[in-house]
Structures are given as C-alpha cells and as structure tokens.
C-alpha cells in the first residue's frame, strides 16, 4: 500500500484530513460515488471544530455529508458511531418528512444554510464535501 502525506491539488488540508468542496450538485448516491472514485468519502463530522471548518468553506448552501439512514438507523459512511458521535441537527430534525410529494421519506443528511443539519430526499442535487485522511495507508488490491 501507499500513504498520502499531502493533500491533492484543489483539496484543503485541515487537522490531518483533506477536504474537497464541490461547486455544483449531485444526488447523494452520485456524490458518494464521486468521493469513492477519489479514494475519499463524503465528509464525516466528528466535532464542533470540524463542523465550523466545513461550514466556513461551504457557506449558506445545502450540502450533502456522509450520513444517511437508507437502511434503517442513521449511519456515517466511514463507520463512525452515530449514536455516541457529534450531532448538529436543526430543531425537530431529522423528521423523515413524507410531505414533499417525491415519494418516500428523507434518508440523507445535509448542511443547511445556517450549517445545522436536516434530512432530505437523497435525489436532490445538492453540493457535497469529500474527505480523506492523511497518513492512512491505502490498500492496493493484489493484481490477478
């Protein structure tokens, strides 16, 4: 394997992680795939300090993060424990609202215009943030 010791071009380093901020939108699953192809993941917010950092860079724009409950319980894409971890929901959120008329509820979390979190329809084309950790050994699969 190999270790990344500095952030790629156009990524921002912060606290031993690299962040990439999109400037156009995709559905949550497509944003997730984008990050994965970059050997990254949708941003996982683990502290108030990281929340403020991300919020500063995205501004007052709806932006996907790596949190969803498409399979039942809320889960972070990197396996970080949701129940014991940092949360910053808007009051009365998440509410799995069905009243939008798009079918189903709301299974994907995003930063709202004030930075606090809301659950929304995963198909909405919001901006997103990718994150990858520095010094993390990337596992290169053996060639057949």
């Amino acid at each position: 394997g190999s270790e990344r010791t500095c952030c790629p071009v156009n990524w921002v380093e912060h606290e031993r992680s690299c962040y990439w901020f999109s400037r156009s939108g995709k559905a949550w699953a497509d944003a997730d795939n984008y990050c994965r192809l970059e050997d990254a993941h949708l941003v996982v917010v683990t502290s108030w300090e990281e929340q403020k950092f991300v919020q500063h860079h995205i501004g007052p724009v709806n932006t996907w993060m790596g949190l969803h409950d498409q399979n039942g319980p809320w889960k972070w894409v990197d396996g970080t424990d949701y129940e014991t971890g940092f949360k910053n929901w808007r009051p009365e959120q998440p509410d799995d609202w069905y009243g939008h008329g798009l079918g189903g509820g709301e299974d994907c979390a995003h930063f709202t215009d004030d930075g606090r979190w809301n659950d929304d329809v995963c198909q909405r084309p919001y901006r997103w943030v990718c994150e990858t950790e520095l010094d993390k050994a990337s596992q290169e699969p053996p060639l057949l």
Epitope: G1, S2, P8, N10, S24, G25, K26, A27, D30, N33, Y34, R36, L37, E38, D39, P125, S138, Q139, E140, P141
Partner: antibody
C-alpha cells in the same frame, strides 16, 4: 506530456479472454482515477469501467459486470482490463482515459482493437 | 441509466459558418456535461467540461452552454480542421454515458 499507450488487443474467439494494458506517463499515476471506454466499429463511445487511484474502488457498466475486471499496478504506472467470456458485441476499440479535475476524461490513449470472431 | 440524445446526427456547413449541436439528457444532470471532438481513427479530445468551461488549449471558437437537461455546443466560425465528429458525455451518474455523435461535414 501526458501519454497513455494501450496494448493487448487482437482477434479472439467467442468465449475467450484477453488482458489489455495501458502504460501511463507524464503525470502522477497513483493519484489519478482511470477509465476504459470502448467504441464499436461505426458506433458511439461507451464507458466501460473506472478505478480509483489506489485501486480500492471500481465501477463497471452493466454490460460488462462480472466479465471484465479493471485493475492497476501503480509501481508500473499501468492500467489493466481483464476481459473474459468475450462476445461478438465486445468487438471495439478500447481506450484508456485519465480522470482530470472533477473526473472529466481529459487525456485518452490511441486505443487498441479487440475483435471477437470465430 | 441516463440517455444522451444528440441532434442532428450530421450537419453540412461551410468554412466560416456558425454551427450549433444540441445534446439532451433523459434526466437532470445539472452541469455535469462534457463535449469531445473525435477525428477519424483517433481518440476523443476533451473540448468543454462542466457544460461551459473551455479545456486548456482549445480554441475560443468553441463554446458550450446549458444546464439541467438541454445543452449546446457552438462553433462560432468553422475552420477546415473542425469537420469531424462531436459527442457529449454526462458525468452526473454511473454509468457515464455518451451521445451517439454528430458529424460535421463540408457542404
């Protein structure tokens, strides 16, 4: 200067296998996602597969899933496509293409022709 | 899968003409669209990305516009080397898909 050079194409019988290679130079290969895109004679382009810089993430078109395997050897700056259970409809020129900023396909090789025929 | 439909499939024009090619996506792809130029027997070359951004080294006579589902590639003044094939590609969702191509021919 970015260069991508495909090889490994040829004539193969239906059901047969081939391994295509793409030798890369002129950029930091291990940091770049890579793709295979094919073009059947007289037809349009069809995206086949993508792989992340580390090789840890791969994506495939439904038409090749389970038959084609994309891989890479970053120590050799080389991208591969293992193609099995070949069908007549797999006959095409196969291009490797590099993902640039925002994953746009900014550089392409010259292609290698795969012909599936008995 | 997202279908990309180009029109026309071919267009006849003369040197100096303005030519517009359209590409329609079967669903909203915001601005995740690229345009490529392909000469016979050669690999595609990226012209436009993000619907309207000109790739480095591409002449300014090429321009792109549109968002959502409808996009256009415009060549403001055709040059002799421009009489080749052009295609669009969406990078919004896997599988990435291409239009069938538009051939620009000499009238």
């Amino acid at each position: 200067e970015v260069q991508l050079l495909e090889s490994g194409g040829g004539l193969v019988q239906p059901g047969g296998s081939l391994r295509l290679s793409c030798a890369a130079s002129g950029f930091t290969f291990r940091n770049s996602a890579m793709n295979w895109v094919r073009q059947a004679p007289g037809k349009g382009l069809e995206w086949v597969s993508a792989i992340s810089g580390s090789g840890g993430t791969t994506f495939y078109a439904d038409s090749v899933k389970g038959r084609f395997t994309i891989s890479r050897d970053n120590s050799k700056n080389t991208l591969y496509l293992q193609i099995n259970s070949l069908r007549a409809e797999d006959t095409a020129v196969y291009y490797c293409a590099k993902c640039g900023r925002e994953q746009w396909l900014d550089y392409w090789g010259q292609g290698t022709l795969v012909t599936v025929s008995s | 899968d997202i279908q990309m439909t180009q029109s026309p499939s071919s267009v006849s024009a003369s040197v100096g003409d303005r030519v517009t090619i359209t590409c329609r996506a079967s669903q909203n792809i915001t601005s995740w669209l690229a345009w490529y130029q392909q000469k016979p027997g050669k690999a595609p070359k990226l012209l436009i990305y993000s619907a309207s951004s000109l790739q480095n080294g591409v002449p300014s006579r090429f321009s792109g516009s549109g968002s959502g589902t409808d996009f256009t590639l415009t060549i403001s003044s055709l040059q002799p080397e421009d009489f080749v094939t052009y295609c669009c590609q969406q990078a919004n969702s896997f599988p990435w898909t291409f239009g069938q191509g538009t051939k620009v021919e000499i009238k």
